[in-house]
């Protein structure tokens, strides 16, 4: 969590006095101390981790998490059933696929069990918090003497993802970047046969099915170039790895996708 210094000399304060053990438990410091912010990320719509910075508590505190979905059939308050820990202190909660409903408002509540009135509630749009797995099975083939095509797969509904391709040669100091829509392929029209190229790709759940800001991890890099002999079958025998985008994928111009698809459909 980032904090902002509100005054240049730190003079704005809340004094927390602890008197005797007979004092009520809602002493000033405990009841006014803000709870840490909860950050949730939905990993490939397979599971979701909601985490908080447990270290921001001035004493060891096993904060508890409850959640529900606002204005929906799933509005019953649920307790976290799978806590994540940092040094034996709760620092997160993992929710499984069946508990994730991307297109309903997710409400998450953090509470201090030592001081139940110390609680904080946040509302999150889960479709904006999806992080896909990194693209896999990067393959290259020649379209012509000087043109290369890069293909990859995602373990997800392909039409929900946009992609970023980076490539560079061993002579370059920085990457060249190219955005790619849901088609998950990229062509490089002019290739210098004397150079070695490196490609990598990452993906994002945007813009058709959500508006996520976070990219996946980068794929493993794939190389092509001068130290690869022309006889190397790697350049040519990759058709089995290439897949055309199905009509189903191309027809997904709507913002929403069905819960059933999200839970059961994986496109390889």
């Amino acid at each position: 969590l980032n904090t902002t210094i509100l005054t240049p000399n730190g003079n704005e304060d809340t004094t927390a006095d602890f008197f005797l053990t007979t004092m009520p438990t809602d002493s000033l410091s405990v009841s006014t101390l803000p709870l840490p912010e909860v950050q949730c990320f939905v990993f490939n719509v397979e599971y979701m981790n909601c985490t908080w910075n447990s270290s921001s508590e001035p004493q060891p505190t096993n904060l508890t998490l409850h959640y529900w979905y606002k204005n929906s059939d799933n509005d019953k308050v649920q307790k976290c059933s799978h806590y994540l820990f940092s040094e034996e202190i709760t620092s997160g909660c993992q929710l499984q696929k069946k508990e994730i409903h991307l297109y309903q408002t997710f409400v998450v509540q953090l509470q201090d069990p030592r001081e139940p009135r110390r609680q904080a509630t946040q509302m999150l749009k889960l479709q904006n918090l999806v992080i896909p797995w990194a693209p896999e099975n990067l393959t290259l083939h020649k379209l012509s003497e000087s043109q290369l095509e890069l293909n990859w797969n995602n373990r997800f509904l392909n039409h929900c993802l946009e992609h970023l391709v980076q490539y560079r040669t061993d002579w370059d100091h920085s990457w060249t970047e190219q955005s790619v829509d849901y088609r998950h392929k990229f062509s490089l029209p002019s290739v210098d046969g004397q150079k070695r190229y490196t490609f990598r790709v990452r993906s994002r759940f945007n813009p058709l099915c959500g508006s996520a800001q976070h990219w996946s991890e980068w794929s493993h890099p794939i190389h092509w170039g001068s130290n690869t002999s022309k006889e190397n079958p790697f350049l040519f025998a990759l058709e089995a790895e290439q897949k055309l985008i199905s009509e189903e994928d191309l027809g997904g111009e709507q913002k929403l996708i069905s819960e059933e698809d999200l839970h059961h459909h994986h496109h390889h």
Epitope: L1, N2, T3, T4, I5, L6, G10, N11, E12, D13, T14, T15, A16, F18, S29, T32, L33, P34, N53, S54, S55, S56, E57, P58, Q59, P60, S86, E87, E88, I89, S91
Partner: antibody
Framework: QVQLQQSGPGLVKPSQTLSLTCDIS??????????WNWIRQSPSRGLEWLGR?????????DYAVSVKSRITINPDTSKNQFSLQVNSVTPEDTAVYYC????????????WGQGTLVTVSS | DIQMTQSPSSLSASVGDRVTITCRAS??????LNWYQQKPGKAPKLLIY???SLQSGVPSRFSGSGSGTDFTLTISSLQPEDFATYYC??????????FGQGTRLEIK
């Protein structure tokens, strides 16, 4: 590497105010996982925690009951330091004073100042 | 407040001895118990945190155990540099943070 450097007078007259400062390097007094503590040590009381300040979107202070009415701990973000003031001192306040940092999630004092012997005497 | 009681308050031992110091909390503190070593004129130095975890750079002859209310610090084979005062400290329920009264380890 975090370092805490203490400064302040070693001799204070009874009824006056004891003032010490702890300069922080290698961390920020506004860290949102640290608490900045004052501890003193005397033969009669052993190691005695006096209080702490910490920043969690605003400043908080906790004080020990034994000194609550006489103590003030203040952070200074512009100088990256925090200070201790003890009012109306008596000879019983004679001790070695330490500043120390505690952080979660392990909650121990890993970094200490070098200590300042403060003698209360006329 | 949670009171911390160390025993013994002082102890005489010889180089090579195995030494055990105990610390008892007035109520359960889970494993939030730390041990410090202090030499004259110096600030305390962290040895063991979370009851049994050895702080980086501390010799392996130091070990800690316990949970709840009863804890021990063990030095398996005393070295000349180990003669010092040892303190336990709880951070489970704060404020206040409380220390044991100390155990002074002297050369026999």
């Amino acid at each position: 590497q975090v370092q805490l450097q203490q400064s302040g007078p070693g001799l204070v007259k009874p009824s006056q105010t004891l003032s010490l400062t702890c300069d922080i390097s290698g961390d920020s007094v506004s860290s949102n996982i640290a608490t900045w503590n004052w501890i003193r040590q005397s033969p009669s009381r052993g190691l005695e925690w006096l209080g702490r300040t910490y920043y969690r979107s605003k400043w908080y202070k906790d004080y020990a009951v034994s000194v609550k009415s006489r103590i003030t701990i203040n952070p200074d973000t512009s100088k990256n330091q925090f200070s201790l003031q003890v009012n109306s001192v008596t000879p019983e306040d004679t001790a070695v004073y330490y500043c120390a940092r505690m952080t979660g999630p392990r909650y121990y004092f890993e970094y200490w100042g070098q200590g300042t012997l403060v003698t209360v005497s006329s | 407040d949670i009171q911390m009681t160390q025993s013994p308050s002082s102890l005489s031992a010889s180089v090579g001895d195995r030494v055990t110091i105990t610390c008892r909390a007035s109520q359960s503190i889970s494993s939030y118990l730390n041990w410090y070593q202090q030499k004259p004129g110096k600030a305390p130095k962290l040895l063991i945190y979370a009851a049994s975890s050895l702080q980086s750079g501390v010799p392996s002859r130091f070990s800690g155990s316990g949970s709840g209310t009863d804890f021990t610090l063990t030095i398996s084979s005393l070295q000349p540099e180990d003669f010092a005062t040892y303190y336990c400290q709880q951070s489970y329920s704060t404020p206040p943070i409380t220390f044991g009264q100390g155990t002074r380890l002297e050369i026999k």
